[in-house]
């Protein structure tokens, strides 16, 4: 049928809980394209009418909620004037228990996310809500270890928990709690945060100065193999520490499965007033879902973040 | 529509105390914070605080700790937001503004202010 | 606390032509979230702030599409790609990305 297959990462979701996709493909859906869902190679696009518990949402797929029988893989198709693109998602639907639900504790969780606060630093942990226009988002609720989070450390600012002076005790199981109200009807949302902390790198005051990356971004085809350093000078005698993060994540943490985008070994120059470290990162293959994302190069306490872009299309 | 309406001018003595309200409507008060942005005679825009009707929750600027405290009154939708010893430099348009939604920030909803002059 | 700086201080513009206003914070505002907690609003004489772009490049409900935004975690660019009489006043940068919210002094906007 003429149309280009290109395959995302599987999501893993909980029942009984709304989720959304977005059929997003930078180069292609900011033009004059249509984009229908199907599941399971099926010729019969999903229903476009919002009272159906599954449905297509402008470019997203809407499940209020999510069920069971709702595993499997669907693909959406963009049609531009002179293209086809076919993107398949992979959804596996599983039951999870964040705390006992028999004694009053939070119901089920979505797919756990994996975040880093930084010891001594005011942080913030962030609850992932993705869903269409379509969608009002209401109030919400974080907990930890299953009881809601209070106190004067602690700030509930649109989709974020600040965290002011953030200690070891804050480690541990988080949650956060939004009501979602879809054509008059509420639904709830809950999503599962492990929450790790990360040492404030360094001893009084040396400020690491990364040289390259410079927050910009980097075009790159698709499917290719790509490697970019971080340089970064410290001085002789830092103990600060150096890393690439997605997510908030070690990339070797993030892609630990299909080891797909990896850390390297760090390596380092020494001058007479400072060293010169070195650390890449190496994208065996990129893939869609790496455009648009932050990749961010860590030292101590400076950041530094590239982001793919695909390269503009070439008319001549 | 969501609408946030202020209560009138004031002219206070330094050392005075100044209760500003700013009663809300068109939305369910308890969900979102009333935030506090104060502008002096041709100077820029200043965050003061933000208060929570829900839990009565504050989180102000260190510059304000000591001297502003946010009340609000439910029954009313009305938030206060209360400055103690005043001082000339205290003379300025105070706002309360509310975010753009409980998860996009911004403001999108501001008061019509109200001038509080300090003067002898 | 997170300092805006902007500039220029003033910006006398001709009606139909474009301007082009900058702010620099002095902390990257790019959560590892991918959101970038930045902020424009424009203050008309004698009324409050009116949001025009949120989380640094979407557009506030009702504001024309002349208005945009773009930058870096630490470098932002207004453009206005056609300036209106209307669009005159005070621009203001802003940051929620930690607390205390911090504005920039902002930018007069005059027409010529």
């Known amino acids: 049928d003429g149309c280009k297959d290109i395959f995302m990462k599987n999501e893993i979701l909980s029942a009984s809980q709304p989720f959304a996709f977005n059929c997003t493909f930078p180069p292609i859906t900011s033009g004059e394209v249509s984009v229908t869902w199907y599941k399971n190679s099926s010729k019969i696009p999903v229903s476009k009418i919002i009272q159906s518990r599954i449905h297509q949402d402008e470019t997203w797929i809407l499940f209020l909620p999510m069920e069971w029988g709702d595993s499997g893989v669907y693909q959406c198709v963009i049609k531009g004037r002179d293209s086809c693109h076919r993107i398949h998602v992979n959804l596996t639907v599983f039951e999870k228990h964040w705390c006992d639900t028999s004694i009053g504790g939070l119901p089920n969780l979505s797919d756990e996310y994996k975040q880093i606060l930084h010891l001594g630093k005011d942080d913030s942990l962030t609850c992932h809500l993705h869903f269409p226009k379509s969608c009002v988002l209401g109030p919400i609720k974080w907990y930890k270890d299953c009881n809601e989070i209070k106190g004067e450390r602690f700030t509930v600012l649109e989709t974020r928990l600040l965290v002011s002076n953030v200690s070891a005790e804050d480690r541990g199981n988080y949650a956060c709690q939004a009501i979602l109200t879809h054509s008059g009807k509420q639904y709830e949302v809950l999503n599962g945060i492990t929450v790790s902390i990360t040492e404030r790198a360094g001893y009084g005051g040396s400020v690491p100065k990364i040289i390259y990356p410079k927050n910009h971004s980097i075009e790159v085809q698709l499917g290719t193999t790509l490697i970019v350093d971080c340089n970064v000078t410290d001085t002789k005698d830092n103990t600060n520490l150096r890393c690439w993060r997605v997510n908030n994540t070690l990339v070797d943490d993030y892609y630990d499965e299909s080891k797909r985008i990896r850390e390297g070994v760090e390596t380092h120059v020494s001058f007479r007033e400072h060293n010169l470290y070195t650390v890449n990162i190496t994208f065996l293959e990129v893939k869609m879902e790496d455009y648009g994302l932050p990749f961010m190069c860590h030292a101590g306490v400076s950041t530094a973040y590239i982001i793919l872009q695909l390269p503009a299309p070439d008319f001549r | 529509q969501v609408q946030l309406v202020q209560s009138g001018a004031e002219v206070k003595k330094p050392g005075a105390s100044v209760k500003v309200s700013c009663k809300a409507s068109g939305y369910t008060f308890t969900n979102y914070w009333m935030n506090w942005v104060r502008q002096a005679p041709r100077q820029g825009l200043e965050w003061m605080g933000m208060?929570?009707?829900?839990?009565?929750?504050?989180r102000l600027n260190q510059k304000f700790k000591d001297r502003v405290t946010m009340t609000r009154d439910t029954s009313t939708s009305t938030v206060y937001m209360e400055l103690s010893s005043l001082r000339s430099e205290d003379t300025a348009v105070y706002y309360c503004?509310?975010?753009?939604?409980?998860?996009?920030?911004?403001?999108?909803?501001w008061g019509q202010g109200t001038l509080v002059t300090v003067s002898s | 606390d997170i300092v805006m700086t902007q500039t220029p201080l003033s910006l006398s513009v001709t009606p139909g032509q474009p301007a082009s206003i900058s702010c620099r914070s002095s902390k990257s505002l790019l959560h590892s979230n991918a959101i970038t907690y930045f902020y424009w609003y424009l203050q008309k004489p004698g009324q409050p702030p009116q949001l025009l772009i949120y989380q640094m490049s979407n557009l506030a409900s009702g504001v024309p599409d002349r208005f945009s935004g773009s930058g870096s975690g630490t470098d932002f660019t207004l453009k206005i790609s056609r300036v209106e009489a209307e669009d005159v006043g005070v621009y203001y940068c802003?940051?929620?990305?930690?607390?205390?919210?911090?504005f920039g002094g902002g930018t007069k906007v005059e027409i010529k």
């Open positions: 802003a940051q929620n990305l930690e607390l205390p919210l911090t």
């Open positions: 503004a509310r975010t753009t939604s409980m998860i996009i920030g911004g403001f999108a909803y």
């Open positions: 208060f929570h009707p829900s839990n009565a929750v504050t």
